[in-house]
Every structure is written in structure tokens, then in C-alpha cells.
């Protein structure tokens, strides 16, 4: 066979679908690899061919499109399962070709089982809601294209195992779930089950996402440096170890990069000759506010080091701040020589 541009196994698109549910999988060639779409390719006389390799097998085989009730079918650039079975798991390849052109890509498809509470090995998308921020909503994901707009599906929302009913701050509104006020207690996994009819059969789509309630932008502040501060003086003798923590609080900000760094005499520690090490630790609050601590350490400090300026800097999308540590050389205690004058007197 003539040469084919092989894009290999596209593990970036690890597709997971639930057992016994419909699945529609678009050929990734047109989405990520080629500069033209399926319609253009089709009108240019190119044919899309599908085949697969079963799990734990090496043999590529054609997909059986003659199963009862058209369980697996192809429509344009979409491979349809109505519904999936557990043993559909494997690597699927779509190949676009004619007599002079060939391009193909493979991708893994995993058919996943779920329990009655929607627990499964499925990787869940995370949706962040701002705490106490007014009405916010989540939308049942990845259900487009499964049924025409003329079909009115029924949608049931669950939090964990429980149908959302008698929840006074959450309103199911069809494909949307509206949070009148998001609280920490709203953290958890939310599942929408979409039920729709097709050709006399009833299909279910199950979609689960994780809701994480995070700090609100209306409460966000620039970074706050808790240490160093004006109340603590780092007083050392030459030869001792100097440890200065820089502890910074960052409000949660969506997509903000939080940075902490030290400067010594205005330079980054990497750019000066003294033997300094910096260790960083990060902790998060329940609403994903962040506290970063960078400990600056000089094992054996010199009198020169104790004259330097040590400044902690912090930056987020809300602004930049800096604070100098108060470092000084310990003054040796004066040595008193006690002279005892002994007088012997006689009465």
C-alpha cells in the first residue's frame, strides 16, 4: 500500500464513554491535524475509513457496521455507538484517503462502567463557582448533536447519589443547574441524566462534573505579605544560620499566576555569589485562596551578609507588593571582668 501520513496514537484525546449509552465520536483529523473540514474533503473525492484494534490485541480490523439495530454507524466524520458495549474499548483509527492522498490518526476509546451513584473511573471536568456571588449556573456538558432540536429530552440532576429536590439554593432548569448562592456545602459531583427517544428506543446520556466553590472576585485583594514584617528582627552573629520566611496570602483569582520571590541587594538570589537556598511550600484554603511560603536560608551568614537588603516580593493579577526583612548583626554582650579586692582588717 502507498505511503500514508500517520499521526500516530493521539493519547491527548483519551475518550471515555459510559457503557450502554450512545456515543458520538468525531474523527480527530479534521479537528486537530488537517487544515480542511470533512465537507471539503468529501467534495474533493476523499473517503473516510474507520477501523479499530481491540483492547490487548495488535490486529487492526474493520468496524462492523452491520450490527443489529445499526448499533455502530458512521455519519459524515462521526462514529456513532447506539449504545456502547464494554468490549468496544480499544484504539480507533480514522483514515482519509483517495488514490493520491492518505492521512490517518488513531485514538483510544475507553468504555467505562458506572455504579448506581454515578461513580466510575471517568475523569471529571471541574467547574468553579464563586462563593456567595449571585446566580451562577453549570450546564450539562457534551450533549450537543445527540438529538435534533425538535426532540425535547427530560433532564434529571443529581448531587452525588441524590436527585436535586428539596435543595433550597439550587434550581434545576433543564440543561442548566442554577445556584442561587454558591456555598462550600455545594462542593461535590453533579450529574445530569438526559433521556431522549430515538426510533422507538429510549437512550440515556450521563454526564458528571465536579463543582468547586472558590473565592469570589468581589472579595479578592492584592497579595498580603504576612512575613517578613516590622515586628520581627532577624538578629544573627556571623557563622550562624539565617532563616527568613516570606509568607504571602493570595486571594483566589481565576487563571491568575501567583508569584513569590526574594531579592538580595536588588538582585535575584541566582545572580549573586553567596550560598543561599530557597525552599517553597504552598497551602490552599477551602475556597482555593493560596498561602505561599518561601524560606530564604544562608547556612553560615557573614557580617557582610547581615548588611544586605533582603526583600520579599509577591505578584498576582491583583497587583504587586514587596516587604524588606529587618536583618541585623547581633551586638556581642559586653564582658565584665570582676576584680575582687580582699581586705583583711582587724578590729
Amino acid at each position: 500500500s502507498e505511503r500514508c501520513d500517520d499521526w500516530g496514537l493521539d493519547t491527548m484525546r483519551q475518550i471515555q464513554v459510559f457503557e450502554d449509552e450512545p456515543a458520538r465520536i468525531k474523527c480527530p483529523l479534521f479537528e486537530h491535524f488537517l487544515k480542511f473540514n470533512y465537507s471539503t474533503a468529501h467534495s474533493a473525492g476523499l473517503t473516510l475509513i474507520w477501523y479499530w484494534t481491540r483492547q490487548d490485541r495488535d490486529l487492526e480490523e474493520p468496524i462492523n457496521f452491520r450490527l443489529p439495530e445499526n448499533r455502530i454507524s458512521k455519519e459524515k466524520d462521526v462514529l456513532w455507538f447506539r449504545p456502547t458495549l464494554l468490549n468496544d474499548t480499544g484504539n480507533y483509527t480514522c483514515m482519509l484517503r483517495n488514490t493520491t492522498y492518505c492521512s490517518k490518526v488513531a485514538f483510544p476509546l475507553e468504555v467505562v462502567q458506572k455504579d448506581s451513584c454515578f461513580n466510575s473511573p471517568m475523569k471529571l471536568p471541574v467547574h468553579k463557582l464563586y462563593i456567595e456571588y449571585g446566580i451562577q449556573r453549570i450546564t450539562c456538558p457534551n450533549v450537543d448533536g445527540y438529538f435534533p432540536s425538535s426532540v425535547k429530552p427530560t433532564i434529571t440532576w443529581y448531587m452525588g447519589c441524590y436527585k436535586i429536590q428539596n435543595f433550597n439554593n439550587v434550581i434545576p432548569e433543564g440543561m442548566n443547574l442554577s445556584f442561587l448562592i454558591a456555598l462550600i456545602s455545594n462542593n461535590g459531583n453533579y450529574t445530569c441524566v438526559v433521556t431522549y427517544p430515538e426510533n422507538g428506543r429510549t437512550f440515556h446520556l450521563t454526564r458528571t462534573l465536579t463543582v468547586k466553590v472558590v473565592g469570589s472576585p468581589k472579595n479578592a485583594v492584592p497579595p498580603v505579605i504576612h512575613s517578613p514584617n516590622d515586628h520581627v528582627v532577624y538578629e544573627k552573629e556571623p557563622g550562624e544560620e539565617l532563616l527568613i520566611p516570606c509568607t504571602v496570602y493570595f486571594s483566589f483569582l481565576m487563571d491568575s499566576r501567583n508569584e513569590v520571590w526574594w531579592t538580595i541587594d536588588g538582585k535575584k538570589p541566582d545572580d549573586i555569589t553567596i550560598d543561599v537556598t530557597i525552599n517553597e511550600s504552598i497551602s490552599h484554603s477551602r475556597t482555593e485562596d493560596e498561602t505561599r511560603t518561601q524560606i530564604l536560608s544562608i547556612k553560615k551568614v557573614t557580617s557582610e551578609d547581615l548588611k544586605r537588603s533582603y526583600v520579599c516580593h509577591a505578584r498576582s493579577a491583583k497587583g504587586e507588593v514587596a516587604k524588606a526583612a529587618k536583618v541585623k548583626q547581633k551586638v556581642p554582650a559586653p564582658r565584665y571582668t570582676v576584680e575582687l579586692a580582699c581586705g583583711f582588717g582587724a578590729t
Epitope: 446566580i135 428539596n166 435543595f167 433550597n168 434545576p172 432548569e173 433543564g174 442561587l180 448562592i181 456555598l183
Partner: antibody, heavy 119, light 113 residues
Amino acid sequence: QEQLVESGGDLVKPEGSLTLTCTASGFSFSSNYWICWVRQAPGKGLEWIACIYTSTDTTYYPNWAKGRFTISKTSSTTVTLQMTSLTAADTATYFCARDLLVVTSFNLWGQGTLVTVSS
Amino acid sequence: ALVMTQTPSPVSAAVGGTVTINCQASEDIYSNLAWFQQKPGQPPKLLIYGASTLASGVPSRFSGSGSGTEFTLTISGVQSDDAATYYCLGVCTDISADDLYNTFGGGTEVVVK
């Protein structure tokens, strides 16, 4: 047993102000409840005025009530409704109700307090 | 804004008969609807929430159905004690305005003969 009791209803002159109080017994507003005010003019239907979420003090009002009515939680057992620029159209029995914004099985109503606006 | 329209009013029924009250929402409120019963001089009493869930202690002769914009309260085997005014209450959110609508229908009086 859980109860809501409204108080503060009175005869008030047009353009006057009045504050109504809703007092809970048998439960406290430190839990997550919507406490709402609803009114009913004599011989007429029910009309929603305001709601407050008791654990966060978040409030919602219909557009017509914004600015003239203010709902507040004043203690762990009391919610008030401040009313200003009153007119004869505000004459009604004012009810306080629990979990009415999103109606749940925890819905509970007080007996109401009568407000009359007349010169 | 959300408008809830109740029909008919008044409605009369014989003891043992069936009464159907309709409530129409001006926009899709899914299943976010409750039904209340009110007798003269009393506060409203919750009968049904979530369009079809019977509140605790409410007799099973009351039932609710519908979703979207059309809702129905049915009283099967009407009793004289069911003479009252019935209200529907719909709720929906407007995320663009960070607002919500909590609107009562105009009420339907049920007369039992």
C-alpha cells in the same frame, strides 16, 4: 414546634414608613433558609415582596419592590421588612414564609400582620 | 418578568367529583412550580412542590403534573373541606441580570356543591 410570627402591622399615613418583624420559634435562622415576605391585599391574590438567605444575608426582590422595601436579618431568630413611601396600594396582610424562593418541603408560613395605609 | 396565568376561576365541583386547575407560565420554568391552598383568614398551605411532589401530610387526592409552561393541579374525589382558593407559584432565574422571578398566579377559587 416550628413557627413564624409576624408583628409590627399598624395603621400608617400615606408616604409614611413601617418596619415589620418576623420571629422564628422552634428553629433558628443560623441554618440555610430563605425567609420571605409575601403580601395579600384585601380580597386579592398573593404577591412576593422579598427574600433573604439566612446564612449569608443574600437578598432578592421583584423589580417593583426594589428601593422601597428592605429585608434584613436582625438576629438569629428575627427578620425585618422595612417599608418606605407607603401608599394605599400597600394596604395588605403581610405574611412571612420560610423556603418560598425555591419551594421545599420545609415551607412554613406565619399567620400574617395587617398593614393599613390611610390618612 | 415571569407571568403566571391561572384558569379557570371560579370553578365548582360536586363532592366526589374531580377538579382540574391550570397554570400557565410565560416562559419555561421546567418543574419549578408549587401549588398552595388558602382558606379565608388563614395563611397559604403548601400542597405540591417541584410540579408533582406531594408535600407531607397532604392527602393523595391532590396531584400535580406538567413541566415547562403548562401545569395542572387535580383534586380527585373532591371533599367539602377542599373549598378554598388555590395558587400556583413559579420560579425562574435570569442569569444575565443576576435576578430571579418568584411569581404567584392570580388564584382559582374552588366552590364545592
